[in-house]
């Protein structure tokens, strides 16, 4: 015969555990229902009645199946110099991240402890890997036949235009200049941009510095805001 499905609350068999989304209530000595995310235990179970759940109040949340008597308070509102990338709802805490053009150099459980500006690749260098919420831009020197003439955290190296007759050959930081006859092939005008990272959910992992063409010596252990321009010598 198939085993009967037990309805909460029920006394577990000796040595067995309660099922998924149930918990063992020490007082009632019964397996009882947990409350779903967005709810909390308003009344704990007894031997004869199951857990009574209620919705979290405004500005509070529970993210997991639970039997907590009160929902957790959402973090304080994001300050004016941060961006709210996840609103406070009954099921999730608010998450604040760095403003556009910055990344999280030292993360904390919800949000960021230290924001740093995204590295800008100087002329002769292009973006090899774009910045994200939690990692800096990685720059690379422009390979022969390509150039970047900007100081930017988004521009990649672009191919030199190909001339019928070259007036000035291109280099890593300057496009080729053609004589008055038009070039045989030309890139569209304007810099090529990589898309800015879209703020989604903050990742709760600590970034590690990427190798780059001019590594910063400013950080001795894994973290540290980057210099403002990759390969720059400073003042």
């Amino acid at each position: 015969l198939p085993a009967q499905v037990a309805f909460t609350p029920y006394a577990p068999e000796p040595g067995s555990t309660c099922r998924l989304r149930e918990y063992y209530d020490q007082t009632a000595q019964m397996c009882c229902s947990k409350c779903s995310p967005g709810q909390h235990a308003k009344v704990f179970c007894t031997k004869t009645s199951d857990t009574v759940c209620d919705s979290c109040e405004d500005s509070t949340y529970t993210q997991l199946w639970n039997w907590v008597p009160e929902c957790l308070s959402c973090g304080s509102r994001c300050s004016s110099d941060q961006v709210e990338t996840q609103a406070c709802t009954r099921e999730q805490n608010r998450i604040c991240t760095c403003r556009p053009g910055w990344y999280c150099a030292l993360s904390k459980q919800e949000g960021c402890r230290l924001c740093a500006p995204l590295r800008k690749c100087r002329p002769g260098f292009g973006v090899a890997r774009p910045g994200t919420e939690t990692s800096d831009v990685v720059c690379k020197p422009c390979a022969p036949g390509t150039f970047s003439n900007t100081t930017s955290s988004t521009d990649i190296c672009r191919p030199h235009q190909i001339c019928n007759v070259v007036a000035i050959p291109g280099n890593a930081s300057m496009d080729a200049v053609c004589t008055s006859t038009s070039p045989t092939r030309s890139m569209a005008p304007g810099a090529v941009h990589l898309p800015q990272p879209v703020s989604t959910r903050s990742q709760h992992t600590q970034p590690t510095p990427e190798p780059s063409t001019a590594p910063s010596t400013s950080f001795l252990l894994p973290m540290g805001p980057s210099p403002p321009a990759e390969g720059s010598t400073g003042d």
């Epitope: 760095c98 230290l114 924001c115 973290m223």
Partner: antibody
Framework: QVQLVQSGAEVKKPGASVKVSCKAS????????IHWVRQAPGQGLEWMGW????????NYNEKFKDRVTMTRDTSISTAYMELSRLRSDDTAVYYC????????????WGQGTTVTVSS | DIVMTQSPDSLAVSLGERATINCKAS??????VAWYQQKPGQPPKLLIY???TRHTGVPDRFSGSGSGTDFTLTISSLQAEDVAVYYC?????????FGQGTKLEIK
């Protein structure tokens, strides 16, 4: 309320080391970065580096990195800054400071510790 | 390193008059500039951050402006308690650096 209380004045000879303490209260010590800033007599402010007590992450100003060590004792919510091989131009008031949010402008400061280096 | 240069080094202004202090960064720091007030024997006190955001409790006679490399702190109507040394600081990237200070006195 947030408070940073520093150790008392020190007089040291050139070549010696000094260790300044900064006791934090009014917040969770391991949740905020501590910075050290110094000010020579009649001079401006100079950032020496930051230290994160929660995981020992550290970032020293290049100017001081060979001589400065920042540490902490979480059991007593205290940060330390040790400067070695002292010279007369290290005579200054040394401040610990912290910032509330993730950007480095300092909304809380210790009262300062005067370090005098003299033979 | 980014060098922050303040002007003037000292300034004397009559009570009730406007005081203006300038700060120039040696390279673009976006709007990541803070201003502090320091009185003798005290640590600096944060007045303004992100160029123009007043810190909690700072009177509205203090205001800041600028972007890129040029920044200004303005006290619209000088009060006796505003006599102090004022410092700018960029909070853009390490190392964070301060201006040399501007001493503000009453004329």
């Amino acid at each position: 309320q947030v408070q940073l209380v520093q150790s008392g004045a020190e007089v040291k000879k050139p070549g010696a080391s000094v260790k300044v303490s900064c006791k934090a209260s009014g917040y969770t010590f391991t949740e905020s970065i501590i910075h050290w800033v110094r000010q020579a007599p009649g001079q401006g402010l100079e950032w020496m580096g930051w230290f994160y007590p929660g995981s020992d992450n550290i970032n020293y100003n290049e100017k001081f990195k060979d001589r400065v060590t920042m540490t902490r004792d979480t059991s007593i919510s205290t940060a330390y800054m040790e400067l070695s091989r002292l010279r007369s131009d290290d005579t200054a008031v040394y401040y610990c400071a912290r910032h509330e949010g993730p950007y480095v402008y300092f909304d809380y400061w210790g009262q300062g510790t005067t370090v005098t280096v003299s033979s | 390193d980014i060098v922050m240069t303040q002007s003037p080094d000292s300034l004397a202004v009559s009570l009730g008059e406007r005081a203006t202090i300038n700060c120039k960064a040696s390279q673009d720091v976006s709007t990541a500039v803070a201003w502090y007030q320091q009185k003798p024997g005290q640590p600096p006190k944060l007045l303004i951050y992100w160029t123009s955001t007043r810190h909690t409790g700072v009177p509205d006679r203090f205001s800041g402006s600028g972007s890129g490399t040029d920044f200004t702190l303005t006290i619209s109507s000088l009060q006796a308690e505003d006599v102090a040394v004022y410092y700018c600081q960029h909070h853009y990237s390490t190392p964070y650096t301060f201006g040399q200070g501007t001493k503000l006195e009453i004329k």
